[in-house]
């Protein structure tokens, strides 16, 4: 429990409930305490969103949420004299905020972003169905380390998709990655309905490809050593090592979750380097290796985006065809 005595009579409703938007997707509700609340009541506020989601009991007279404003969102607020969830709060007051106006069919679709190598973000979208072909799009973005909303300058086109990329560098030793990037796409003429998205910085991360440093044979094992992409520590990555043998025309793919350089055959203490031993490889044939990496769930929410493949490296000799 919390606060003072909890009178059985219901408290009056909160007053002056209002809602506003900060940045691109930060919705903030504020209210005033109820008029004529019991003097022996230590006020707490019960609030939840329209679909009874995210119930909260707190003493603050504000509540905020980071949400893409593509749909109407409502908050209901009531007052009560304790933190007890079973206590009946006052009459709930509701305040809603609607997305910007416009024909829903004019809004862009499939708005999504990928954070490339923790250094730049690339967003893409499809034009809305009810729009002119000469629509000029603008993407705006905001995150905690920016003082104001920025406009993305590098608009490009890939087939039917439009896109824009902007610098976004991981800040070391901060809670940077616990936050999100807020995105909005609209047109310069104001004819289309704006579209919003929120990109958590722990998801949709695509590393650069790794760089193979060394291939060597020891008995019938192939030792592969590579450098991981900058900005990533090896424990945060999973790997796929592909080995193609020209003679047997075999194509082996190894899914590697841990790639430590512990064998004496590997070069030691090289920073940001990973290693893997491929068993049973014929040294007197040509073997071509390539590697790709992806983030894992130890460090990131998302583990679906593979890097592009590394450049290939070969070892062994190609047999002459007889």
């Amino acid at each position: 429990g919390g606060g003072g005595a909890a009178p059985t009579e219901t408290q009056p409703p909160v007053t002056n409930l209002s809602v506003s938007v900060e940045n691109l997707c930060t919705v903030i509700w504020t209210w005033n305490p109820p008029e004529g609340a019991s003097s022996n009541c230590s006020l707490w506020y019960f609030s939840h969103f329209g679909d009874k989601q995210d119930k909260k009991i707190a003493p603050e007279t504000r509540r905020s949420i980071e949400v893409p404003l593509n749909e109407r969102i409502c908050l209901q607020v009531g007052s009560q004299c304790s933190t007890n969830e079973s206590e009946k709060p006052s009459i709930l007051v509701e305040k809603c905020i609607s997305p910007p106006e416009g024909d829903p069919e004019s809004a862009v679709t499939e708005l999504q972003c990928i954070w490339h190598n923790l250094s730049y973000m690339k967003c893409s979208w499809l034009p809305g169905r009810n729009t002119s072909p000469d629509t000029n799009y603008t993407l705006y973005y905001w995150h905690r380390s920016l003082e104001k909303i920025h406009q993305c300058e590098n608009i490009f086109r890939e087939g039917q998709y439009f896109g824009c990329s902007f610098d976004l560098t991981k800040v070391k030793d901060s809670s940077f990655e616990q936050h999100s990037v807020q995105i909005m796409v609209k047109d310069n003429a104001g004819k289309i309905k704006p579209s919003f998205n929120i990109v958590p910085l722990t998801s949709r991360v695509k590393p650069d490809p790794p760089h193979i440093k060394n291939l060597s044979f020891h008995n019938d094992d192939l030792y592969v050593q590579w450098e991981n992409p900058q900005n990533f520590i090896s424990r945060c990555l999973f790997y796929e090592v592909e080995v193609n043998n020209s003679q047997t025309e075999t194509h082996n793919v190894f899914y590697v979750q841990e790639a430590k350089c512990e064998n004496p055959e590997f070069e030691r203490n090289v920073e940001n380097t990973s290693c893997f031993m491929v068993p049973g490889v014929l040294p007197d044939t040509l073997n071509t290796v390539r590697i790709r990496v992806k983030t894992n769930k130890l460090c990131y929410e998302d583990d679906k985006l593979w890097s592009n493949w590394s450049q290939e490296m070969s070892i062994g000799k190609k047999r002459n065809s007889t």
Partner: antibody, heavy 118, light 107 residues
Framework: EVQVLESGGGLVQPGGSLRLSCAAS????????MTWVRQAPGKGLEWVST????????YYADSVKGRFTISRDNSKNTVYLQMNSLRAEDTAVYYC???????????WGRGTLVTVSS | EIVLTQSPDFQSVTPKEKVTITCRAS??????LHWYQQKPDQSPKLLIK???QSFSGVPSRFSGSGSGTDFTLTINSLEAEDAAAYYC?????????FGQGTKLEIK
């Protein structure tokens, strides 16, 4: 050269199923929506279904909704149309078309004939 | 749903004549109207995109005009190889809708 080629048509009984394929080449497949359009014998063109380049947006004509399923495999540069609960009125030449720009069809296949008859 | 009405349904013309086919939309569709040609036993081919833009490789005798609800396909100096069905298509919203077609016969 940009090309699309349909396959999988044939004779099927009412209530039966058929799966059409459309193999594409000569362009970055995942950047373009693909569409199925059909033409009943001696009749005009009718839009059937569309799938966006990355496969997140899928649309159907009311006449096939709930019976047909469009899908794509971007690693194989192929789009599919799974047709279930086929009816006589589904008899048509089925064309696969690549979409371009703001939703027009710039490349069409030669079509594959689907005949629904007992 | 957008309804497209083409006229005429059928036209018989002599070579070198000028031909005009019209397409009327049931509501304004901006310039989201495209014209296709389909010769007998062939698949359709794009002629005009966005109401008035010629598609690459299309002979210059084909041109398009209009916006909103009224659109026109014009063939200047008709040639024998232009015998075909012509369709207008709206891409304004979904579903895509096709006109019923205009069949052009060369006398």
């Amino acid at each position: 050269e940009v090309q699309v080629l349909e396959s999988g048509g044939g004779l099927v009984q009412p209530g039966g199923s058929l799966r059409l394929s459309c193999a594409a080449s000569g362009f970055t497949f995942s950047n373009y929506a693909m569409t199925w359009v059909r033409q009943a014998p001696g009749k005009g063109l009718e839009w059937v279904s569309t799938i966006s380049g990355r496969g997140y947006s899928i649309y159907y004509a009311d006449s096939v909704k709930g019976r047909f399923t469009i899908s794509r495999d971007n690693s194989k540069n192929t789009v599919y149309l799974q047709m279930n609960s086929l009816r006589a009125e589904d008899t048509a030449v089925y064309y696969c078309a690549k979409e371009e720009g703001h939703w027009y069809f710039d490349v069409w296949g030669r079509g594959t004939l689907v005949t629904v008859s007992s | 749903e957008i309804v497209l009405t083409q006229s005429p349904d059928f036209q018989s013309v002599t070579p070198k004549e000028k031909v005009t086919i019209t397409c009327r939309a049931s509501q304004s569709i901006g310039s989201s109207l495209h014209w296709y040609q389909q010769k007998p036993d062939q698949s359709p081919k794009l002629l005009i995109k966005y109401a008035s833009q010629s598609f690459s490789g299309v002979p210059s005798r084909f041109s398009g005009s209009g916006s909103g609800t009224d659109f026109t396909l014009t063939i200047n100096s008709l040639e024998a190889e232009d015998a075909a069905a012509y369709y207008c298509v709206s891409s304004w919203g979904l579903p895509y809708t096709f006109g019923q077609g205009t069949k052009l016969e060369i006398k």
